[in-house]
Interface confidence: low
């Protein structure tokens, strides 16, 4: 009778084990072990027991002890079970960003590991078990589908293997994959709202605002604002699930024409964009041209108004004939035209909007000097000792200098209150002088004495 000890062993892959083969007869003809494993016999006293060290056990094996006794040959098997943890536990790679509401398939692959009967694969979100299945196949594959939710944002998904050898008196061996950190996002199907001027004048600034609601996580959203090739640098303010990006846009003559304004929002691996056209225009104020800004009375004056080639102008409220960018009028300068304003208004249509620009110029008419009866009476009669104010107003542009003298020396105090005396009586020569010339007028002052009353 042949026996073996131990009859059943569980050992780590590559490990060694001592196996004792015994026989019941004292003088066996033969006692040994049959195994493909590397073996070493340990020398023991006696003939009916042998101990072998079996090494580098890589897989399950059934070494067999045999003995040949006088009463016949017999055998006994020992069962070696090898255990080892998986060589690879891995989640199939996935895009780090996943839209909320999408079904996400987690796939865990496990290579190796034994005994398979004791090997379980567990898919986890954080510490929460999503699925637990025995490892089947090589590589073993376990999948589960997760409906992506907002609160999954930042969650770590992983795969764990459990080799449970506690029933065999050993421990629970765990291997965990590298985690997959899920970044969830919501990018609404609606494009961002873009508010901007439809038209913008060269060398001015405009404000552009781009906004979108219903984003998650809003802090991860990237906003790109551009006018043509010009990247704008917005100030972004965030709400709970919204943002508003505000930028100033400056345009130059190089930008003139129709430009594309773009607002794009990128979140996760998706983007939404809104396009709008902005017409950049150049529209200088119209030009008012006077033949000369300063003319003498009686001179012919041409007033011209010139504007942008596509503009329509009116000069002093009168539209150009025919309607267009130029208008003019002719006049003979009179003193009444001095200080007269000539106003030109130009209107340009840009992308369906009417833009208005104005310019005004003033005409200076040089005339005079003038001394007439109305403003400088030729005869004054005043009672002696009365209080009087001699008045004589000379007109002209530029304003003339006025002097009234009696006998070339005695001045009449124009515009001053005086007490009438005999000395005041007489004929005065009033002379008004300016760059435009000189005029004279005689003024007689009569004084009534009390004796004549």
């Amino acid at each position: 009778q042949t026996s073996v000890s131990p009859s059943k062993v569980i050992l780590p892959r590559g490990g060694s084990v001592l196996v004792t083969c015994s026989t019941s007869c004292d003088q066996p003809k033969l006692l040994g072990i049959e195994t493909p494993l590397p073996k070493k016999e340990l020398l023991l006293p006696g003939n009916n027991r042998k101990v072998y060290e079996l090494s580098n056990v890589q897989e399950d094996s059934q070494p067999m002890c045999y003995s040949n006794c006088p009463d016949g040959q017999s055998t006994a098997k020992t069962f070696l079970t090898v255990y080892w943890t998986p060589e690879r536990v891995e989640l199939a790679p996935l895009p780090s960003w996943q839209p909320v509401g999408k079904n996400l398939t987690l796939r865990c692959q496990v290579e190796g590991g034994a005994p398979r009967a004791n090997l379980t694969v567990v898919l986890l979100r954080g510490e929460k078990e999503l699925k637990r299945e025995p490892a089947v196949g090589e590589p073993a594959e376990v999948t589960t589908t997760v409906l992506v939710r907002r609160d999954h944002h930042g969650a770590n998904f992983s795969c764990r293997t459990e080799l449970d050898l506690r029933p065999q008196g050993l421990e629970l061996f765990e291997n965990t994959s590298a985690p997959y950190q899920l970044q969830t996002f919501v990018l609404p199907a609606t494009p961002p709202q873009l508010v901007s001027p439809r038209v913008l004048e060269v060398d001015t600034q405009g404000t552009v605002v781009c906004s979108l609601d219903g984003l998650f996580p809003v802090s991860e959203a990237q906003v790109h604002l551009a006018l043509g090739d010009q990247r704008l640098n917005p100030t972004v303010t965030y709400g709970n699930d919204s943002f508003s990006a505000k930028a100033s846009v400056s345009v130059t003559a190089e930008d003139e024409g129709t430009q594309r304004l773009t607002c794009a929002v990128i979140l996760g691996n998706q983007s939404q964009e809104t396009l709008q056209t902005v017409t950049i225009y150049s529209f200088p104020a119209p030009n008012v041209i006077l033949t000369k800004p300063e003319v003498s009375e009686g001179t012919e004056v041409t007033v011209k108004c010139e504007a942008h080639p596509r503009a329509k102008v009116t000069l002093n409220g009168v539209p150009a004939q025919p309607l267009g960018p130029r208008a003019q009028l002719l006049l003979k300068a009179t003193p009444e035209d001095n200080g007269r304003s000539f106003s030109c208004s130009a209107t340009l249509e840009v992308a369906g909007q009417l833009i208005h620009k104005n310019q005004t110029r003033e005409l200076r008419v040089l005339y005079g000097p003038r001394l007439d009866e109305r403003d400088c009476p030729g005869n004054w009669t005043w009672p002696e000792n009365s209080q009087q104010t001699p008045m004589c107003q000379a007109w002209g542009n530029p304003l003339p200098e006025l002097k009234c003298l009696k006998d070339g020396t005695f001045p009449l105090p124009i515009g001053e209150s005086v007490t009438v005396t005999r000395d005041l009586e007489g004929t005065y020569l009033c002379r008004a002088r300016s760059t435009q010339g000189e005029v004279t007028r005689k003024v007689t002052v009569n004084v009534l004495s009390p004796r004549y009353e």
């Epitope: 780090s96 960003w97 590298a178 950190q181 794009a264 996760g268 691996n269 998706q270």
Partner: antibody, heavy 120, light 107 residues
Framework: EVQLVESGGGLVKPGGSLRLSCAAS????????MSWIRQAPGKGLEWVSY?????????NYADSVKGRFTISRDNAKNSLYLQMNSLRVEDTAVYFC????????????WGQGTLVTVSS | DIQMTQSPSSLSASVGDRVTITCRAS??????VAWYQQKPGKAPKLLIY???FLYSGVPSRFSGSRSGTDFTLTISSLQPEDFATYYC?????????FGQGTKVEIK
């Protein structure tokens, strides 16, 4: 100026090991995912590995280096590392470290690269 | 893994020319494609990301567009400093993968 400077390259025999370092400056290093990308002589670009931001970062590797290379970071030192073991002749390349910006793996800042030569 | 197939592998052009480089993804990558420029002995530089967004500091003569799984990098008027190798890259999923490169040479 935002900068990444690699070091640690050199000549090594097949089966040998090497540790590459990448020093970051002028940006908040701990906020960014970081990556290693390599370029074999006269060839194109190949992504090697990345490491996430956060207190307990996670890592990912190209199949060609999995189990042999280990990426790590030290936020206190503003440094990124690549431990390369069991090196093969086909690992000969210029290794670049790069900063990752969203969305996905866009590499916006690159170091000048360090040459690793594996030859017997 | 997603394959990125770039064409042509090289081209000759003159200063002032309009240059177009194409990249095709083996599967849908949404708009997640970046373009890089690399000069000999230097590190690559990011030009475009998310198919059409110009990275800050990149001249406006560079632009990108998408049509399905085909992506295009256009240089509207080639400048002397633009002679280099250009790579596309998908940043839709891990692992990120690059095109084999297009070398733009002086005619």
């Amino acid at each position: 100026e935002v900068q990444l400077v690699e070091s640690g390259g050199g000549l090594v025999k097949p089966g040998g090991s090497l540790r590459l370092s990448c020093a970051a400056s002028e940006f908040t290093f701990s906020d960014y995912f970081m990556s290693w990308i390599r370029q074999a002589p006269g060839k194109g670009l190949e992504w090697v590995s990345y490491i996430s931001s956060g207190r307990s970062p996670y890592t990912n590797y190209a199949d060609s280096v999995k189990g042999r290379f280990t990426i790590s970071r030290d936020n206190a030192k503003n440094s990124l590392y690549l431990q390369m073991n069991s090196l093969r002749v086909e690992d000969t390349a210029v290794y670049f470290c790069a900063r990752v910006r969203g969305p996905g793996d866009v590499f916006d800042i690159w170091g000048q690269g360090t040459l690793v030569t594996v030859s017997s | 893994d997603i394959q990125m197939t770039q064409s042509p592998s090289s081209l000759s052009a003159s200063v002032g020319d309009r240059v177009t480089i194409t990249c095709r993804a083996s599967q849908d990558v949404n708009t997640a494609v970046a373009w890089y420029q690399q000069k000999p002995g230097k590190a690559p530089k990011l030009l475009i990301y998310s198919a059409s967004f110009l990275y800050s500091g990149v001249p406006s003569r560079f632009s990108g567009s998408r049509s399905g799984t085909d992506f295009t990098l256009t240089i509207s008027s080639l400048q002397p400093e633009d002679f280099a190798t250009y790579y596309c890259q998908q940043h839709y999923t891990t692992p990120p993968t690059f095109g084999q490169g297009t070398k733009v040479e002086i005619k």
